[in-house]
Each structure stands twice: as C-alpha cells, then as structure tokens.
C-alpha cells in the first residue's frame, strides 16, 4: 500500500500509463522542512521498484529514468534515509504499461437473412491491456453513413442494427473499424461489399419428405426458403453413416426429387441456401429432418443349412437353419420365414410360417425324396426361396475331404484346412464348414454355425461365435450334386490344462479285471479339446510310482477296463484329463480290492 504523500511528492512524465518499451521519468522531491534533521546533505532519497533499490541521491530531490518495464502495473516507492534512523516512506507511484492497438484485421460483415441487421467482426490483434474504444463506420450510397461504438477491452463484434434491402443489390457499402486507446490508434483496411455479398440467408425451414405410393423410388423433399434464394445444397445420409451425399440445385423452388435412397433406411436430411451463384455465402445448414424410407420386397436369398438325425427305423429328424438376410437384402422388417417341405415323388407339401426363429425342426419318414424351400417375407413381399434337397450329407465316402486340421489363429479364430476328396476334386461344387460347441450328450439344441467355401478353397477361417477355452466339433462337407461327403475334427481357439480331472463314480469287478466308470468333466472346466484320459493306480500305503493307462478321448466314452491288478490288494485309483496344453489336477480318489483268484 502507498501512503499519502505528506512528506514529499512524486511526479511522473509523460504519464502513469505508458507504451511498452518506452521510458518513464520519475521525480521524487521533499516538501520544505521534511528532510533529515540538521542539514539537507544528509538527506538520502532512495527509489524502490517493488522491493528492490534502483536509484538513490543525496539532496532534496531525486530524478530517475526507468526503461524496460513489463506489461501491467509496476510499483515505485520513494523513501528517505537519515543517519541512525529507519527509512521513511515519502511517496509512491504506480506505472501501468500497455500497448497501442494493432491494426484490426479480417474485418468482415454479414447480414443474417433478408430481414436481419448488419453485423461486423474483426480480429483485434495483440491484447492492449487498456480500455480500447472501437468505432465501426459504414458508408453507403448517397453519402449515407452509420457509426457504432463499443467500449470494452475485448471488443471484436458490433451490430449496426440496420437492415440492407435488395432494392439496389449491386450498390457498394464500405466498412471500417478504428481502435483508440490512451496510447494510440489504428484503423482496419476498408471492407467493401454489396447486399448480395453480405446477406447470408436464413437456413431453410419446414422440411418435409413425401414418398409417392409408399415407394422409395418416388421420393420428394420439400422445404421453405427466403424469397431471394437462388441456390440450394442438399445433403443426406443414412443415420448410421458419417459420409454425406451432396446435391446442388438451382431454382429448386422448395422441392427436389431424390432417386438413390435405399429402402427401409433412416436418413438424415439437411438443406442450405444461397442468394447468388458466385456472390455471398451459404446459409447455415437447416435443422435435420430424420425420416425412414418405405420397405421394398426382400432381395437376395437365405443361406440355409440342415442336420439329419436318425430316430428309429422309419423316422428321421430334420433340423433346418438359416441366416438372417443383411439389412440391405431384407429391405424391411422381416415378419416371418416361410418354410415349405415337399416329398418330391408323391408331391405332398406342407408350408409353415416361422416367426422369431431362424431354425425349424420336424420329423419325416426315412423313405422318399424330400426337399425344402425357405424364404423371408416383409410387408412388401418375399425373397426368392432357397431350395435344398435333403440328402445324407456324409454318405459318399469318396467325397470326404482329407487331412482335415483345425489350428488356433489368434484370438477367437480357428483356421480349418483340408485336402480335396480322392474322387475327382473337380466334382466338388462347394465346401461347407460347420461348427458347434462340443457337448458330451450330443445336444441338438446347441447352436449350429456354418460357412460356405468355394470349391477351389482348401481352408476357412472361422470366427463367428468362437469362444476361448471351448472345444468345437468341426465338420467339413464336400457337396457335389445330390451327394455329399464329410470329415470331422475337434478344435479350439485357445486352450489350457483342464481345471479338474474326471470323477470316478463306480468300479466294478468282471472276470478278474475291473471296469472304471466316470463322469465327464463339466464343459466349462475342460478348457479346450480333451485329447486323453489317464487312469492312475497304486497300492495303498505304498510310496512307489503309480502305474497309468492312457486312453484317447472319445466324446461318448465314460468307462474303461483294467486287467493288471493283483487280487486281494487294496489299490487307490484316480483320473486326470489332458488337453494339448497339459494335464489336469487329480480327480477324486477311489479305493478298490479285487476279490478274484490270483493267476
């Protein structure tokens, strides 16, 4: 804080507010009889800049020229030092350093809409740190002038509050902005324009779309515009897309036909306007109109696959599966699937509509030649039916693909490879690779996946519905006319040692040997495809190494005989399971003593 100047004065030249880089002259002078006691030669006047001494002088006054002050406020204090006493504050001064305004740049003016008012913006340039007055001047025909001022440190926008009219659209107007503060002034370059240059139309409004006869091919977009609009830009895109389609139209008079819209797609539409071909600026984009195009009948055909399961000597179960049409093929909401089953010789046919499912199961006689046709229907019609003759897909041994292998390929992918069948490979019309989670019970409810591969391919990467640490039963079918051959393999995308071993549930004695039965390891604990089981045994209370028997894994097997046990010796038995990654921990331990005679 600076105290009032009772003992002396500080004067500042040229002003307390100076230009950055300029010099300020500070004079400190004592008032009469305010010096040191005795005589004035003992007076020592000291000038401080903030808390740092910058000058001193013996006598009644001190004059100091100061340069290099930074932007903002710098505090100077003048003090008197007498012998054998503390320094006494005489007076202080604050000097404020600012900047003269730079020339305002990029002055541009705009009138929003035919009824709007003229407003201009500019770039102020460097911050002056000072109150700067901006005066915006507009001169027009017939010596008309308008002026507007704004008095703010950060002024870069002014609205004249006047409306230019289109009576003489080619008349010239000139705008100029002048910035003035206590350290200087500067004016922008003049900006000259006509009505057509600066009027930016209001964005179009009241946008509507009409589809004649509910058809996507007969679509008209309607909107309203200001009266003088000559040009329009339309942009539209599917709501889930980032890329716009753009159309420029002249003299559209508020309507335009769109010919390339896709059916059953939600689109976003926006329109912009302009008054002149090459003068002026485009309006802002209108608010978006969102609208769904009408449905059209589906295109494309369903991908259909099937499974046959023997029930008894006279009946078989057929399970049909199909994949959803892509959005672009469905062209609407699929209401149902139509499945037709026909016995080809007798001509009997049954048709069923399936909703909410992409599969269908039925039981048919094992005799006769059967065919199915499946199509998808929306509100406008049906897709072409996919026809399939039901055959024994694995009957032709010579068509079976050879050397089928399944290998992990990165995260959640399995690469299936095969060799063409022995029979003339050129007879193969296509391969189908089918996969489903392996369930020991052979559960038919497990989802089925498949993909089709061209006849010249000998590999396929399967990735759909593949999970880590799950074993899949993979089949490769080679199809040729009404014949098929198949080969199967187990595969997984990622594996580790099983989390547990099989649980022995029974040991029974049969003619001097034993039969061990076990429960399968739960699927979620198998951690991939099992390769082997191991049965371990050793005499109870013995420290010797256990003996073991390794059995190749088969899905349906859950018992195995052992005939190398000695009678009347108590054994401890347990089991483990192995994947390619390693062996599980022990399953439960069971004790058993064979009662039969010794050999």
């Amino acid at each position: 804080k600076i105290d009032a100047c009772k003992r002396g004065d500080v004067t500042v030249k040229p002003s307390h507010v100076i230009l950055l880089g300029s010099t300020v002259n500070i004079t400190c002078s004592l008032k009469p009889r305010q010096g040191c006691f005795h005589y004035s030669r003992r007076n020592k006047l000291i000038l401080y800049k903030f808390d740092r001494r910058i000058n001193f002088h013996h006598g009644h006054s001190l004059n100091s020229q100061v340069t290099g002050l930074p932007l903002g406020t710098t505090l100077f204090v003048c003090k008197l030092a007498c012998i054998n006493s503390d320094e006494i504050q005489i007076c202080g001064a604050e000097i404020f350093v600012g900047v003269a305004p730079e020339q305002p740049q990029n002055l541009s003016c705009i009138q929003k809409g035919e009824q709007g008012t003229v407003a201009c913006t500019w770039e102020r340039g460097r911050d002056t740190h000072l109150y700067t007055e901006y005066t915006l001047q507009l001169s027009g025909p017939k010596n008309l002038t308008w002026q507007k001022q704004c008095k703010d440190i950060y002024c870069d926008y002014l609205d004249f509050g006047i409306n230019l009219t289109p009576e003489s659209p080619e008349s010239n107007f000139t705008a100029k902005v002048t910035a003035v503060n206590s350290l200087g002034s500067s004016s922008s370059l003049p900006s000259t324009f006509t009505f057509l240059d600066i009027v930016r139309p209001l964005p179009p409004w009241d946008i509507r779309i009409k589809f004649q006869k509910a058809s996507v091919s007969r679509c008209t977009l309607y909107w309203r515009d200001e009266g003088l609009v000559l040009l329009n830009r339309l942009r539209y895109r599917p709501s889930n897309s980032r890329l716009w389609n753009m159309v420029n139209v002249t003299k559209a008079k508020g309507r335009h036909d769109l010919l390339d819209l896709k059916p059953f797609t939600e689109y976003e539409f926006q329109i912009s306007s302009k008054l002149h071909l090459y003068k002026g600026s485009w309006s802002d984009w209108s608010e978006s109109l969102r609208a769904q195009t009408p449905e059209e009948e589906p295109t494309g055909m369903l991908d259909v696959w099937y499974m046959k399961r023997h029930i008894d000597y006279s009946r078989q179960q057929i399970s049909l599966f199909w994949k959803n049409l892509s959005v672009s093929e469905a062209r609407g909401k699929i209401l149902h699937y139509q499945v037709t089953l026909q016995e080809l010789t007798g001509g009997k046919a049954m048709t069923q509509n399936i909703t909410g499912h992409t599969s269908w199961t039925t039981v048919i006689p094992r005799t006769g030649n059967w065919a199915v046709a499946v199509s998808a229907a929306n509100s406008k019609g049906s897709s072409l039916p996919t026809r399939i003759n039901i055959m024994n897909l694995c009957e032709a041994g010579l068509l079976a693909p050879r050397q089928v292998s399944a290998n992990s390929e990165g995260m959640d992918n399995i690469l299936v490879t095969w060799q063409p069948p022995r029979k003339d490979p050129s007879a193969v019309q296509e391969y189908v690779v089918e996969w489903r989670e392996l369930h020991p019970g052979g559960d038919t409810q497990v989802p089925l996946n498949w993909l089709r591969s061209r006849p010249y391919n000998v590999s396929a990467l399967i990735s759909e519905n593949i999970k880590s640490y799950i074993c899949y039963e993979i089949r490769v079918y080679a199809l040729s006319g009404d014949q098929g051959g198949c080969s199967s393999i187990l595969g997984n995308s990622k594996h580790k040692a099983p989390l547990s071993g099989p649980h022995i549930n029974a040991i029974t004695e049969e003619k001097g040997s034993i039969l061990i039965s076990w429960n399968s390891i739960p699927v979620q604990e198998q951690m991939g495809c099992l390769l082997h089981y191991r049965i371990y045994w050793k005499e109870r209370d013995s420290n010797s190494q256990p003996q073991l028997c390794e059995i190749p894994y088969r899905v349906s097997q859950n018992s195995h005989p052992i005939n190398s046990l000695q009678p009347r010796v108590t054994y401890v038995l347990w089991m483990t399971a192995l994947t390619a990654a390693g062996e599980s921990s022990h399953g439960n331990e069971r004790e058993f003593c064979l009662q039969g005679k010794a050999n």
């Epitope: 600076i2 406020t73 007076c91 001064a93 604050e94 000072l130």
Partner: nanobody, 119 residues
Framework: QVQLQESGGGLVQAGGSLVLSCAAS????????MSWYRQAPGKQRELVAE???????TYADSVEGRFTISRDNAKNIVDLQMNSLKPEDTAVYYC?????????????WGQGTQVTVSS
C-alpha cells in the same frame, strides 16, 4: 463501471482561478488513476494532469506550476486547482478514472464541464 460527475466549470477572466471537482460513484474501488483531460474546439483531447492512487502526479508542460491536482481516496474525489488562467486554457474539461481489471485497465469518462477564459 464507474460513474463520474464533473463540476466547477464556468466563465473566468484571464489571470483568474477556478477549481474543478470530479466525484466517482458506482464500483469506485481500485481506481488506479484519476485524470483531467481537455479538448478545445477543433483540437484533439489532451492530458492536463493525473494523480495515482498513491498520490504521485503528472502535469502537462503547458500547465505545470499553474495547476495542482489532488485526490481524496476515501471519498473518491479529484480536484483540479487552476490558477493564472489563460485564454488558451479554454476547453471542455473531462474527468477520467482508470480501474484495475484483472491485468488490464478499464477507463470511465465524465460528460465534461466547460471552462471559458476571457481576455
């Protein structure tokens, strides 16, 4: 913003004296600098004298020794004592207050008071 009200102007004979007074109201805290400027017909506005918050002063060369500026910080009043007036001192005198505003200065001006010195 600060509102400034000038008073004390009038007609005076050459060699006479006048005291101009300016009172600041509104958000008058942190007034860094109070100044008197003048504008004669057909001329640019020029600084006459200024006084800082701490009491330091600046005078235009043309008035040094004749005019004295003083300030009462408590009442936010600044006076300009004008002695030995000359016809060339005739002008509209404006009071100005500069306030600290962040790291900038914000200025406010009074409406002005007429001083006429007749010969």
């Amino acid at each position: 913003q600060v509102q400034l009200q000038e008073s004390g102007g009038g007609l005076v004979q050459a060699g006479g004296s006048l005291v101009l007074s300016c009172a600041a109201s509104g958000s008058a805290a942190l007034i860094f600098l109070m100044s008197w400027y003048r504008q004669a017909p057909g001329k640019q506005r020029e600084l006459v004298a200024e006084v800082s918050r701490g009491g330091s002063t600046t005078y235009a060369d043309s008035v040094e020794g004749r005019f004295t500026i003083s300030r009462d910080n408590a009442k936010n009043i600044v006076d300009l004592q004008m002695n030995s007036l000359k016809p060339e001192d005739t002008a509209v005198y404006y009071c100005k207050a500069d306030q600290n505003y962040g790291d900038s200065l914000r200025s406010s001006w009074g409406q002005g008071t007429q001083v006429t010195v007749s010969s």
